[in-house]
């Protein structure tokens, strides 16, 4: 057994089996390039402003870094896809969905018709799905991440759809309105089994979801609180109920981070009682997004993630542990429930 | 209820410097957010934004004026103070304080105070 | 410093009537990060708008702003007797924040 000599040159998890020897990591780690070393990945904050989009160390003191983009006006809504270690973000001024590797290279526009205000968005990571919402044309909608296939998901009383989080893995995705009456609404990652969870709220932002705690975080723009509740909408409670105009919000490990506009500021507390508050950065104008870019955030698994759910097109997932495959505008789903055809 | 209140003296001499206080209520520059901006007008003109000073104690200026201005704030006296070297009777206005609870953005304002230059 | 230039320098309408004042930037000051204030004689300025579109507190709904990249606009949809005054855009997508030269509206 190869393994049996200095662990196979492994640092921490050597696995024998027929087809050769093979290094692999604990839960937390990854494997380097080398093929042989685990470390963990460095965390980093992701956050828009203007025609920036910067990186901050969650573990070292590189601070406040942009990402090299060129031709970015108004970036807005940010995610990430952490396989490829890709970037996505949406321009408001531009009317454009763009993507590029963290290092700033292979930019490009995945969306570019059809926008108005995409003010939400968010990478389904395991179908490898892109899901935005948009201010302006009232709609939801959903491509694969290259912007191909894309679909309408939700239109119907949508009231200037804002904030967009996925929970995968469970086959959720849930937003934000910010019209008549806000509200925080959940549906099927294909648009069915529509539910308003939190009617009694302002204009909630920065929706972002606890994968491990299971529990719901966003901050509300009239109230400038920051609350949370259970995935249900249920067992609210206040987190920081002091700021004075709390905007965008992430959350990672035992700590939410979020920004302020009336202090300029990325700050952070812990999750749960708001406690032990830091200033990450200070003297920052209206940062619009803030995000934690680490493979922790993109864990889990569905049938989408397994050979796309043997669907032509998109495969959305949907509760519990299900999916359906969804087909692009004008094209209709054959028989067999896979493929589409064309009009 | 935010108030704000400009005080200095409503005539100043050529090459003098000129200092204004704002007094204001309603607000706290410590750790609540927000910040305190100058402005003026000089008399049947437009407005022009001077500096700002943020409750974490960030400063901008003017790009003209920079050489010239200085802005501080004392937060135990609810206070900012503008100081404007040589004075010059181009610089006759009324000079305004502002409050920023978002950034750049003047949502309450002094009634203003008048000062001329002249010799 | 990016030059805000407001147009018409003068509007003379009659109350009910709909006002259109306009605000174009030298350069491209995105979505968000216009304000315009409105100033009456021996009066300071107060707040109407910011973000662009956001009314300010206690401001009428007949204020409404628009606009966005170099071109915004300022809306009046039914003159009150109260409106006639000054109006100034302010940017501050850009350091330093200008301010436009004004459009009076006054009453014809």
């Known amino acids: 057994n190869p393994c049996a000599e200095e662990n196979g040159g492994c640092s921490h998890l050597c696995l024998y089996r027929p087809q050769g020897l093979r290094c692999a990591c604990p839960i937390g780690f990854e494997l380097i390039s080398d093929m042989k070393t685990c470390i963990v990945p460095e965390a980093f904050l992701l956050f828009s402003r203007r025609a920036d989009i910067r990186r901050i160390s969650l573990e070292t003191n590189n601070n406040n870094v942009a990402i090299p983009l060129t031709g970015v006006k108004e970036a807005s809504a940010l995610d990430f896809d952490v396989t490829d270690n890709r970037i996505y973000w949406t321009d408001i001024s531009l009317k454009t969905i763009s993507r590029a590797f963290m290092n700033g290279s292979a930019l490009e526009h995945v969306v570019e018709f059809g926008l108005d205000y995409p003010e939400g968005m968010a990478v389904d990571w395991l179908g490898k799905n892109l899901y935005w919402a948009d201010t302006g044309t009232n709609r939801i909608e959903v491509s694969k991440l290259d912007g191909q296939h894309r679909q309408v998901l939700v239109w119907k009383d949508l009231d200037s759809p804002r904030a967009l989080a996925l929970d995968p893995a469970e086959g959720f995705m849930y937003w934000t309105e910010w019209g008549g009456k806000p509200k925080i609404d959940r549906a099927a990652m294909d648009g069915s089994e529509r539910t308003t969870l939190v009617p009694n709220v302002g204009r909630a932002n920065g929706l972002t979801i606890d994968y491990a705690k299971r529990r719901l975080y966003w901050t509300d723009l009239d109230t400038n609180l920051i609350e949370s509740s259970n995935m249900l909408g249920l067992n609210r409670e206040v987190i920081a109920d002091d700021l004075p105009h709390p905007f965008g919000l992430t959350q990672y490990q035992d700590y939410i981070y979020w920004t302020d506009w009336s202090r300029r500021s990325i700050e952070r507390a812990n999750k749960t009682s708001g406690q032990n508050r830091t200033i990450i950065q200070g003297h920052l104008d209206y940062v619009m997004d803030i995000l934690v870019f680490h493979s922790s955030r993109q864990s889990g698994w569905n049938e989408c993630a397994s050979s796309n759910g043997h669907c032509s097109h998109l495969c959305l997932a949907v509760p519990v542990g299900g999916f359906v495959c969804g087909c692009p505008a004008h094209y209709s789903l054959n028989a067999d429930n896979r493929t589409c055809s064309a009009p | 209820q935010v108030q704000l209140k400009e005080s200095g003296p409503a005539l100043v001499k050529p090459t003098q410097t000129l200092t204004l206080t704002c007094t204001f209520s309603g607000f706290s520059l410590s750790n609540r957010g927000g910040g305190v901006g100058w402005i003026r007008q000089p008399p049947g003109k437009a407005l022009e934004w001077l500096a700002w000073i943020d409750w974490d104690d960030d400063k901008s200026y003017s790009t003209s004026l920079k050489t010239r201005l200085t802005i501080s704030k004392d937060t135990s006296k609810n206070q900012v103070v503008l100081t404007m070297t040589n004075m010059d009777p181009v610089d006759t206005a009324t000079y305004y304080c502002a409050r920023m609870h978002l950034p750049l953005v003047f949502d309450s304002w002094g009634q203003g105070t008048l000062v001329t230059v002249s010799s | 410093d990016i030059v805000l230039t407001q147009s018409p320098a003068t509007l003379s309408l009659s109350p009910g009537e709909r006002a259109t004042l306009s605000c174009r930037a030298s350069?491209?000051?995105?979505?968000?990060?216009l304000a315009w204030y409105q100033q009456k004689p021996g009066q300071a300025p107060r707040l109407l708008i910011y973000?662009?579109?956001n009314r300010a507190t206690g401001v009428p709904a007949r204020f409404s702003g628009s606009g966005s990249g170099t071109d915004f606009t300022l809306t009046i949809s039914s003159l009150e007797p109260e409106d006639f005054a000054t109006y100034y855009c302010q940017q501050y997508y850009d350091y330093p924040q200008t301010f436009g030269q004004g459009t009076k509206v006054e009453i014809k």
């Open positions: 973000g662009a579109s």
């Open positions: 350069q491209f000051i995105g979505s968000r990060y």
